[in-house]
Interface confidence: medium
């Protein structure tokens, strides 16, 4: 079986203030079983921008359906976009556990990059 | 050649702590998980936890949680397993196991390489 | 947790005979299922991954099987080296539950 790999396509994405950002992120297996979740940096200080099991991210929405059991898409988009979003954000595929989840594999990250809004 | 080479034996009092070190060589430490499976004396094997050495996090199983540790030193390629608050009825064999799959594989498929384990009586 | 109901715990057999132990997983965990031998005073080894896959050196005589949430191991004619307890573990979400094991002895 080929390995599962976590395709994050753009190195890096320029957005302009109060627009929204789109992340793109694939799996290429659906197993392992385990939610994705989304950060923004690595390491200890990652601060989660969203979770595929659980809570409330009212300004990110998926680009696809996550519930269809043979999705493997898990873009993101961001809305309403302000210079303190940018960083680089990582797409993170996790393995299913009881009572937790285990980090299985990271993709290579996207640079989000925040514009002046244009006047 | 690939191997797991764990700590001496241990003999600890009720309510101490025990830690048991794992040295892995002959492959790549940070691209395979590493389970603790424990046997009581005369019984069957007893999954206690995993840990992923790339990045560190942990999976523990519901009756360990709290008392139990698992942590890696990738400079050593070491991990670790800390039991606190002993009683009796951890006195046991403890392995450190390789999860093999976990890199060349879609999914992590069953360990395939085990320390020789590790001896920890609790006595008072 | 998965609960893995193995049975059975312990059986006799001749050499030669075909020795069968079953392995019930307490819902669908697909073909995520191993099979260990452990031989006293030592730590187990990998015989069959993925429900029915021989892992590299393990001899033929070995084999498993599914059905459902069933699972089966099967040795096809039983050695004097064979003397060991065998158990299953599912591996397709944590914790990596065993079963409770099948001591074989040589009648």
């Known amino acids: 079986e080929d390995e599962l790999q976590v395709i994050q396509p753009e190195k890096s994405v320029s957005v302009a203030a109060g627009e929204s950002a789109t992340l793109r992120c694939a799996m290429t297996s659906l197993i392992p079983v385990g939610p994705i979740m989304w950060f923004r940096g690595a390491g200890a200080g990652r601060e989660l921008i969203y979770n595929q099991k659980e809570g409330h991210f009212p300004r990110v929405t998926t680009v696809s359906e996550l519930t269809k059991r043979n999705n493997l898409d898990f873009s993101i988009s961001i809305s309403n976009i302000t210079p303190a979003d940018a960083g680089t954000y990582y797409c993170v595929k996790f393995r299913k556990g009881s009572p937790d989840d285990v980090e299985f594999k990271s993709g290579a990250g996207t640079e989000l990059s925040v514009r002046a809004k244009p006047s | 050649q690939v191997q797991l080479v764990q700590s001496g034996a241990e003999v600890k009092k009720p309510g101490a702590s025990v830690k048991v070190s794992c040295k892995a060589s002959g492959y790549t430490f940070t691209s395979y998980y590493m389970v603790w499976v424990r046997q009581a004396p005369g019984q069957g094997l007893e999954w206690m936890g995993i840990i992923n050495p790339s990045g560190g996090s942990t999976s523990y199983a519901q009756k360990f949680q709290g008392r139990v540790t698992m942590t890696r030193d990738t400079s050593t390629s070491t991990v670790y397993m800390e039991l606190s608050s002993l009683r009796s009825e951890d006195t046991a064999v403890y392995y450190c196991?390789?999860?093999?799959?976990?890199?060349?594989?879609?999914?992590?498929?069953?360990?395939?390489?085990w320390g020789q384990g590790t001896t920890v009586t609790v006595s008072s | 947790d998965i609960q893995m109901t193995q049975s059975p715990s312990s059986l006799s057999a001749s050499v030669g005979d075909r020795v069968t132990i079953t392995c019930q997983a307490s819902?669908?965990?697909?073909?995520?299922l191993n099979w260990y031998q452990q031989k006293p005073g030592k730590a187990p080894k990998l015989l069959i991954y993925?429900?029915?896959n021989l892992e590299t050196g393990v001899p033929s005589r070995f084999s498993g099987s599914r059905s459902g949430t069933d699972f089966t191991f099967t040795i096809s004619s039983l050695q004097p080296e064979d003397i060991a307890t065998y158990y299953c573990q599912q591996v397709i979400i944590l914790p990596l539950t065993f079963g409770g094991g099948t001591k074989v002895e040589i009648k």
């Open positions: 196991a390789r999860e093999g799959g976990y890199g060349y594989r879609a999914y992590p498929y069953g360990m395939d390489v």
């Open positions: 819902q669908d965990i697909s073909n995520s």
């Open positions: 993925d429900a029915s």
